[in-house]
Amino acid sequence: LIIGFGISGRHSITVTTVASAGNIGEDGILSCTFEPDIKLSDIVIQWLKEGVLGLVHEFKEGKDELSEQDEMFRGRTAVFADQVIVGNASLRLKNVQLTDAGTYKCYIITSKGKGNANLEYKTGAFSMPEVNVDYNASSETLRCEAPRWFPQPTVVWASQVDQGANFSEVSNTSFELNSENVTMKVVSVLYNVTINNTYSCMIENDIAKATGDIKVTESEIKRRSHLQLLNSKAS
């Protein structure tokens, strides 16, 4: 969480941002809140990006003001206009691109004063893994697949029964570049699997950590997946 204060002759207002991550090709949110004002027409929101000389987005007098928007954000940004009056200056960023990563500033002007806060935005690709029993294999084998990751993640297998065991000798992980030549499909195979055990396939890069669990018994197979974004800090 980053909390910023204005430093003008006017009073300062508190602006709060939260570091976040965007999944390339999907829509993302850059979070920013501020002390609200009673009049929408008195609120100005400017989003800026370090190293980019045009604006990311501007909202003033109750509507978008895009004359100074940088080309790299053309047609991809929006604020939640109906929530500005209650102090929400968050930015929706459509079709997140790798180059969107960087330091953003949420700058606010209201009748009470000015304030700003920075936000670190990471971009990459992350997806839920799915673990299945590979019936085609000669021995009991598990196959963990996740369709989109970037940068290249690490894959670690774990088991409930053999806690702390190192499965690197009995697993094989491959990364296959997807058609857009950035993200990769992750496939990891675990051999010599025993029945009545829960196995976890953990995929992690500096943006996200995802886990796919599979419980294999003689009578059933249970699966569960979980994804967590890393480094979501507020400012």
Epitope: G51, L53, E68, Q69, E71
Partner: antibody, heavy 116, light 107 residues
Framework: QVQLVQSGAEVKKPGASVKVSCKAS????????MNWVRQAPGQGLEWMGR????????NYAQKFQGRVTLTVDTSTSTAYMELSSLRSEDTAVYYC?????????WGQGTTVTVSS | DIQMTQSPSSLSASVGDRVTITCRAS??????LNWYQQKPGKAPKLLIY???RLHSGVPSRFSGSGSGTDYTLTISSLQPEDFATYFC?????????FGQGTKLEIK
Amino acid sequence: QVQLVQSGAEVKKPGASVKVSCKASGYTFTDYYMNWVRQAPGQGLEWMGRVNPSSGGTNYAQKFQGRVTLTVDTSTSTAYMELSSLRSEDTAVYYCARRHNYADFWGQGTTVTVSS
Amino acid sequence: DIQMTQSPSSLSASVGDRVTITCRASQDISNYLNWYQQKPGKAPKLLIYYTSRLHSGVPSRFSGSGSGTDYTLTISSLQPEDFATYFCQQGNTLPWTFGQGTKLEIK
């Protein structure tokens, strides 16, 4: 007030290179992109590329890619445009122009003549 | 690249006339359309940016309108100093592209 002052006219032989300068004053040099636009005699305007003075990052028009180099010297608030492998069709007035989306201030222009 | 087609290429008019120049883009340029005036031997000067915003110091007889692909520059009452060449330019996407120009001459 904002001013962009360009270097003087140049006469070059085919195959040579030319480097034109554009000295900015009256504003913070690193706050605005610097574009380069040329105009052949009696012709229209042609955008060549732009440079981000704060990062040195560049964008070039496809037509000039590999032949034009845009640089800046932030210590003197000066932008440079170097065009190599000159041919007669490069005879034109070369302008520097400030900003993104539109060009609010222009240099006075530098005439480059390419002749054997 | 986005193609910009300006018309007419030349135009004769008298002082006091109302004049309109049009510019058509080959695709939607989301109002990122600018107009410049250029006099012989001089650099272009920005008149209007973002379709209809008057650049500082530009007389109010100049106005711009349009949306999507079609844009217009209007001079409500021509003054002697307005006889020049006018260019449109799209700033929606790189590379910037310009119309071929409209030469406004005295009738």
